[in-house]
Amino acid sequence: GITNINCSGHIWVEPATIFKMGMNISIYCQAAIKNCQPRKLHFYKNGIKERFQITRINKTTARLWYKNFLEPHASMYCTAECPKHFQETLICGKDISSGYPPDIPDEVTCVIYEYSGNMTCTWNAGKLTYIDTKYVVHVKSLETEEEQQYLTSSYINISTDSLQGGKKYLVWVQAANALGMEESKQLQIHLDDIVIPSAAVISRAETINATVPKTIIYWDSQTTIEKVSCEMRYKATTNQTWNVKEFDTNFTYVQQSEFYLEPNIKYVFQVRCQETGKRYWQPWSSLFFHKTPETVPQVTSKAFQHDTWNSGLTVASISTGHLTSDNRGDIG
């Protein structure tokens, strides 16, 4: 960067090189050029010459003032006009940064995705800091009192093999950058309570012609967890509100769920599951689209085959699911 240049003097910032966004700052330039009493000192920000708020302090030093500095990063350099020199002489350069101290991390969540071999911990980092911010995840066994720390820039995957201190842990997150440090509340976890079953996937859909046509959704999961509760949500693509059906599921075979839907309408389906009675849900599965027919022929939609446009008999029916707004979080 700009800091790798050979300097003939110094450039520095008050109160510091990295500072809180929105501050008023002063940038000083002091020339130390042999055989040069500078006629004029110039400041450049990102290669553009600054024309205002420059004060000459003495023969060798000038100050540039910025009010309410809002740029996350800027490259500053200053030059001198020396007598008998045709070009400006470079004095020095500096990369400056502005940002915010971290917020207190909240919504700390740790889950174990089945078969992953990892405990994944995430949190809400709060507002953007604009500067390099690191997070230390503390994991302390409630049985052995042993504490492990993991450094990361965002979330963390911790191998379950490294969690040797039993089943109960305290987890908390420290956020730190050059402007400050904050610590989350402690989250108490039991490893058996945070497992999320292997992802449930909708594989296909078919609408069977009957007196009242019905749509069957086929879905499955590779989970080995015995007691699993699932939700399937669906809506016409033109609607805002989801209908939700709940299931207690045994994944020893492919699930078939029946829906009585309006004809000639494009629907979207998603499914998610959790270990029965536990806290965390899977994220909703990817969107699965199915269009109901207008007339008699049977219509099948397969996963990733997003649309079916057959037309068939128009028969009105009402879903039995309850209504919910689309604001459920991914894992709880």
């Epitope: 800091t3 110094h10 520095w12 008050e14 109160p15 510091a16 090189t17 990295i18 500072f19 809180k20 501050m23 008023n24 700052i25 002063s26 000083y28 002091q30 004060t55 302090i57 003495n58 030093t61 100050r63 003032w65 009010k67 990369d95 390099d132 690191k134 050059a178 402007l179």
Partner: antibody
Framework: QVQLVQSGAEVKKPGSSVKVSCKAS????????ISWVRQAPGQGLEWMGW????????NYAQKFQGRVTITADESTSTAYMELSSLRSEDTAVYYC??????????WGQGTLVTVSS | DIQMTQSPSSLSASVGDRVTITCRAS??????LNWYQQKPGKAPKLLIY???SLQSGVPSRFSGSGSGTDFTLTISSLQPEDFATYYC?????????FGQGTKVEIK
Amino acid sequence: QVQLVQSGAEVKKPGSSVKVSCKASGGTFSSYGISWVRQAPGQGLEWMGWISAIFGTTNYAQKFQGRVTITADESTSTAYMELSSLRSEDTAVYYCARGTVPGFDYWGQGTLVTVSS
Amino acid sequence: DIQMTQSPSSLSASVGDRVTITCRASQSIGEDLNWYQQKPGKAPKLLIYAASSLQSGVPSRFSGSGSGTDFTLTISSLQPEDFATYYCQQSYSTPLTFGQGTKVEIK
């Protein structure tokens, strides 16, 4: 030659406030910022905050936020540091310092503040 | 906040010895590091600024080096007047922070 001259020693009761002054001479007072640094007996140096005299901009260490107020009077070339809600741990020598290069190249002689009941 | 860690916390040396004091920052601070000397009952005195620039009037036996997180103050040949406590200080971000100090004593 720049000189920073601080006010004299103070003895204060816990819960009270102290205001230390720092008068600059021999240079343009408003050209550079003034920082306040304290040193408890037998301990290291601790930065408390900074003021840009000409602009009135301040920046305080979080540890002192809400208890310290740094001000400057350009007309008398004097900076002030007021610390409130004093406790015994605030017993220290308080220095004002100014940097005309990166770092503090001019320091006041220090003001001993003793907090005792 | 950026933590500054000096080592050693104290050392004994003789006149003429070469003395090295190190300072480590808890995160990269570029070259925004200054070194001070303090004698009992006196205000600190700036020796080195911007990691390696010798302050005007300071003897050339003092030198500084380093960038990023690791910095060194070297006294090439210790003189009787150099027995004092030395502090590093970062000016990269507020709060400005100092190392805990290194006391150089006579052996």
